[in-house]
Structure formats: structure tokens, C-alpha cells
Amino acid sequence: PRSIDVKYIGVKSAYVSYDVQKRTIYLNITNTLNITNNNYYSVEVENITAQVQFAKTVIGKARLNNITHIGPLDMKQIDYTVPTVIAEEMSYMYDFCTLISIKVHNIVLMMQVTVTTTYFGHSEQISQERYQYVDCGRNTTYQLGQSEYLNVLQPQQ
């Protein structure tokens, strides 16, 4: 069998809402994956499991089942959404994300995704992880790749 390539493309959109009483931020983060089947037979994308971390804390998880099949030598782009919660334990983040004197409230999140594919009863898992910028201060739609976090250092605010 030839490889099945999984490429994490980036954040497509992030929609934010707040619970002022709980000082909590809710971010619905939609990500894009490209899955390429380099084989001469179809493969099933059985599930995608994803999680998002902020400051080494898992803030969101998602699982998609029975997603699609990919034909021979074909590629499919798949969007998946991870609902995340930055809760009261990170109270300072509520201040940051709702601060009107800052215009771009970028935070660095680690996106982790595992794709499980099956073919002829054989199962294969491919994982990716990537750091991404997400604006926690307003709803944002990104050009693919625009939110990539390239810097080794913490971003300047």
C-alpha cells in the first residue's frame, strides 16, 4: 500500500462568545485538513479526533465519525470544528480577550488532530500537531495558512 497523506492546512474560522458572569470565553474553531489517498483503491476516513491546547491545558476536544471515503489517487478537503472553552481558572485570559484597547487579541493554540483511515479491514492512524494564532476578541475568518504560528517566541501583544 502507498501512503495516505494528511496535511493540516490551518484555522478556517474562529467564532467567539463570552459568558460575562462566568468570565468564560467560548471559541468555535473550524480547521481544514487535506487528506490525500495515494493508493489505487478507495480508503475510508473512519474518524477524526482533535483537541486544542492553550498553555498546555486541553481546552477543547472533538470527534467526527464515518466521515467520507476517498477514491483512488484522490484528495479531499475536510473541515472540522472544535468547540473550546477558556474558563474562569484562566481569568486573566477573559480580561485579555475582552480588552478594547487591544485590537487583535491573538492567542497561540496547539491544534492536534488524528485521522483514522481504513482499507481492506486494515486501520491506520496519522497524527499532526501545529501551533496556530487565533483571535479570541472577535469573530474571524482566515485565509488558509494565515493563522500559522511561525515564531518560536511568544507573540508580541
Epitope: V20, Y92, D95, L99, K103
Partner: antibody, heavy 119, light 112 residues
């Protein structure tokens, strides 16, 4: 209904100190940043302080830095402005205002409290 | 600091007709995120300022749609389509693109 009620304004001599208060009601005070804005006798508006909802971020213009201190007590739904080394230029109506993070600005203002600095 | 400039008085308007109030900033208020950080407040006689317009062209909650606002990065106009008696007061533009946040000197709406 959002309500902001300022108090503490007075006649003070130059060099004196004063503490203004603003009691908030009708909304979850601990979830909103707050500001103080003053209106001088010539009706000009001047932003003088802002404080984030949990007091993690505080900003002042250079004109008042070191003389004015903003603080808040979320348990008491109260915003404060401690003023020291007062000058005649500080004479104004002082308004407290709530920041709306969706609008990105101050959306509700109190009725104001008057400070007069004069010998 | 960003300087906001307004005329002290509007051209006198008749009730029921339209009015325009202008404001100019010394620097573009258009951020790279596409938002223009320009605001309009109205201070009615004996009252505190009330928000009319946020981020250059958005009507604040409860504000009648007789009010509208437009502009470039530095030149802005507030329009009142049919002036009513209750619109009398001083209109302030403000910016919060950069600290310190600054206000215009205010324009008093004059009724004929």
C-alpha cells in the same frame, strides 16, 4: 437597566487628594472593563483611565499618570478613582463608563460627579 | 496623540430636514483588521454622553436609524436624515485606535 452612579466630587485645594466612586447596577460588573472620562469646563471630553474586568490591565494618558489611580471592587460592583496632587486643570465633571467589548468602546455613562480644584 | 477635529457648530437645520456633522482625525483610524475605530456620541443638554455609532458605521442598540455614519480613514460624517427636536445637543467623535483615546471638541447641532 444599566445604571452607573458616581459620587465623591468636591471642592479641593490644589495639591489635595480625593477619591471618586462609581456604583454599577443592572449588569454583571465583573465581566466588563470600565473607564473614567472627564469633561472640562469648556465641554471637552478627556479619557483619564481604564481598567479591565479583572483589574489585570490598567491604562492612563500621560497627563494623569502617577497622580490618578483607578481600581475596582467586583464584590461591591464599584469603580474608584483615587486622585492626588490635584491641579486646577483637573477641574471637571468625572464620568464613569462601561466598556462594551462587542462595540469596542464605552457604551453607558453615568451622570457624572463634579470636582473643582481651587484655592 | 491622534487629534480629532470638529467644527464647533453645525449649519442651522430645520426640523424634518437632514443634517450632517463632520469630523477629521490626524491619522487614519482604519486598522489592518478592517475595522475603523471611530465613534460618535451625543450629549443632550444636562445629560451625559450617549453612544450613537460604533466602529464608524454601526448603529448602537436603541439608536434610531435616522442616524448613519460613513467615512474614509480620516474624514467622517454623521448624518441625521430627519432631524427631530430631541436630536439637539453636542455631537462628539472619538477614536480608540490608539492610546490615549481622544475626542473631538464637539459640534453643537443648531436648529433654525
Amino acid at each position: 437597566e444599566v445604571q452607573l452612579v458616581e459620587s465623591g466630587g468636591d471642592l479641593v485645594k490644589p495639591g489635595g487628594s480625593l477619591k471618586l466612586s462609581c456604583v454599577a447596577s443592572g449588569f454583571t460588573f465583573s465581566g466588563y472593563g470600565m473607564s473614567w472620562v472627564r469633561q472640562t469646563p469648556d465641554k471637552r471630553l478627556e479619557w483619564v483611565a481604564t481598567i479591565s474586568s479583572g483589574s489585570f490591565y490598567i491604562y492612563y494618558p500621560d497627563s494623569v499618570k502617577g497622580r490618578l489611580t483607578v481600581s475596582r471592587d467586583n464584590a461591591k460592583n464599584t469603580l474608584y478613582l483615587q486622585m492626588s496632587s490635584l491641579k486646577s486643570e483637573d477641574t471637571a465633571i468625572y464620568y464613569c463608563a462601561r466598556q462594551n467589548f462587542y462595540y469596542g468602546c464605552e457604551d453607558y455613562w453615568g451622570q457624572g460627579t463634579t470636582l473643582t480644584v481651587s484655592s | 496623540d491622534i487629534v480629532m477635529t470638529q467644527a464647533a457648530f453645525s449649519n442651522p437645520v430645520t426640523l424634518g430636514t437632514s443634517a450632517s456633522i463632520s469630523c477629521r482625525s490626524s491619522k487614519s483610524l482604519l486598522h489592518s483588521n478592517g475595522i475603523t475605530y471611530l465613534y460618535w456620541y451625543l450629549q443632550k443638554p444636562g445629560q451625559s454622553p450617549q453612544l450613537l455609532i460604533y466602529q464608524m458605521s454601526n448603529l448602537a442598540s436603541g439608536v434610531p436609524n435616522r442616524f448613519s455614519s460613513s467615512g474614509s480613514g480620516t474624514d467622517f460624517t454623521l448624518r441625521i436624515s430627519r432631524v427631530e427636536a430631541e436630536d439637539v445637543g453636542v455631537y462628539y467623535c472619538a477614536q480608540n485606535l490608539e492610546l490615549p483615546w481622544t475626542f473631538g471638541g464637539g459640534t453643537k447641532l443648531e436648529i433654525k
